[in-house]
Interface confidence: low
């Protein structure tokens, strides 16, 4: 099943997020991803946990998953590099870099997104954009076109309350509010974009979606700048 959803959002403007990627397993959407360099897509490590022998590919330049679009192109994956400390049973270090079989053909609908290198928390209340092709309601309806939602960043102390994530949110993670509007599981790997800069990647832990007491959890890319640079080098 696809790992992710955007709840309470709306259809995105077509091709307005040219960094957006669909990580696909055997031709079906599995996770979100974000183009961070011409030949590299950043996603979540847990996305490939169940991939085993399946064929992993990356779709770029898409708005609709099914309709023909001039900018759409499916790339094979040359190399998958999960963060070395990622583990199946934790949300920590949930990052994955996918090297495309060739450099992406850049254009208005396909372009890398600048990512945050300054390791400083995003101010609570900042509105950030998260997008994905995950299911859009609890009944499991899956959209064909890209959805997005604006979510306010939630401060770590609140997110770490016993009734929320109970201390699990380390300095390398951040939270966004989840009151009816939310990202979830299979939007995993997708981008959290604040002020036009990639700040977070949707984690792929199993979490109740759209419940204000269980805020969305995102891996802070700035905290992993050294690792990202070392892989992309």
């Amino acid at each position: 099943p696809p790992r992710g959803r955007i709840l309470g959002g709306r259809e995105a403007e077509a091709h307005a997020r040219p960094y957006m990627a669909s990580v696909q397993l055997n031709g079906a959407h599995l996770c979100g991803g974000v183009l961070v360099a011409e030949q590299w897509v950043l996603s979540a490590a847990h996305c490939l946990e169940d991939a085993a022998d399946g064929k992993v590919q990356v779709l770029l330049g898409a708005h609709s998953l099914s309709q023909p679009e001039p900018s759409k192109r499916l790339y094979d994956v040359l190399r998958a590099v999960p963060h070395p400390d990622s583990q199946p049973d934790t949300i920590d270090h949930d990052l994955l870099l996918l090297q495309l079989s060739e450099k992406a053909t850049l254009g208005p609908a396909v372009r890398p997104l600048p990512w945050q290198r300054v390791d400083r928390d995003v101010a609570p209340g900042t509105l950030c954009d998260v997008a994905g092709w995950g299911i859009v309601n609890h009944a499991g309806r899956r959209p064909d076109s890209l959805q997005h939602v604006l979510l306010p960043v939630l401060d770590r102390a609140t997110c770490n309350r016993r009734t929320h994530h109970d201390g699990a949110i380390t300095e390398r993670l951040m939270c966004a509010e989840s009151n009816r509007r939310d990202s979830c599981k299979g939007d995993s790997g997708g981008p959290l974009v604040c002020g036009g800069v990639l700040e977070g990647v949707v984690t792929s832990g199993s979490r109740v979606c759209g419940n204000r007491k269980k805020p969305g959890i995102y891996t802070r890319v700035a905290s992993y700048a050294a690792w990202i640079d070392s892989v992309l080098a």
């Epitope: 209340g125 939630l154 102390a157 609140t158 016993r162 009734t163 201390g167």
Partner: antibody, heavy 114, light 108 residues
């Protein structure tokens, strides 16, 4: 029914300490933080801190660091707040609360007087 | 820390009158974590409205809450005698959680 039972009024001398219990019932004690709040006479409320009964994790309001110490006893489903080096400024009603402020104890009046 | 300013500090309302109490925050707070409490003399505060606009269990429908960002309000559509009490707004968007100084509402 969720209940938080606090002890009766305390009259203590300046410089002394007092330990206020908050006994929880009607829910799983480890499922929610216990918050402590101060209300001086005729005034508003001040958050002192909260404690996670599951692992003992505590958040304090900087203002009350060194003044209040929060602890829990899981075996009796009781949270405690100890106030030390008491002065007249500490005279107030102290409440415990849980369920993200949905439930409150009845309050304990602490009077500091020589 | 976020300072919550309530106004008026005191007000008197006649039965049937519409009442609006306001709560202004020194910086933006999340509507999900803006609460209101009712307190009567000698009693503990009671959760009255949570997440800006949701009425707590047992709260009459004449109460409502609204707002966003730095500006929030509690409204009573038609004042009744039992509504006479102090009302406190409260945020826990960021630590430390803070409370407003309260509005004392009296029956005229």
């Amino acid at each position: 029914e969720v209940l938080l039972q606090q002890s009766g009024p305390e009259l203590v001398k300046p410089g002394a300490s007092v330990k206020i219990p908050c006994k929880a019932s009607g829910y799983t004690f480890t499922d929610y933080n216990i918050d402590w709040v101060k209300q001086s006479h005729g005034k508003s409320l001040e958050w002192i801190g909260d404690i996670n009964p599951n692992n003992g994790g505590i958040n304090y309001n900087q203002k009350f660091k060194g003044k209040a110490t929060l602890t829990v006893d899981k075996s009796s489903s009781t949270a405690y707040m100890e106030l030390r080096s008491l002065t007249s400024e500490d005279t107030a009603v102290y409440y415990c609360g849980t369920g993200d402020y949905a439930y409150w104890g009845q309050g304990t009046l602490v009077t500091v007087s020589a | 820390q976020i300072v919550l300013t309530q106004s008026p500090a005191f007000m008197s309302a006649s039965p049937g009158e519409k009442v609006t109490l306001t709560c202004s925050a020194s910086s933006s707070v999340s509507s999900s974590y803006l609460y209101w409490y009712q307190q009567k003399p000698g009693s503990s505060p009671k959760l009255w409205i949570y997440s800006t606009s949701n009425l707590a269990s047992g709260v009459p429908g004449r109460f409502s809450g609204s707002g966003s960002g730095t500006s929030y309000s509690l409204t009573i559509s038609s004042m009744e005698a039992e509504d006479a009490a102090s009302y406190f707004c409260h945020q826990w968007t960021s630590y430390p959680p803070t409370f407003g100084a309260g509005t004392k509402l009296e029956l005229k």
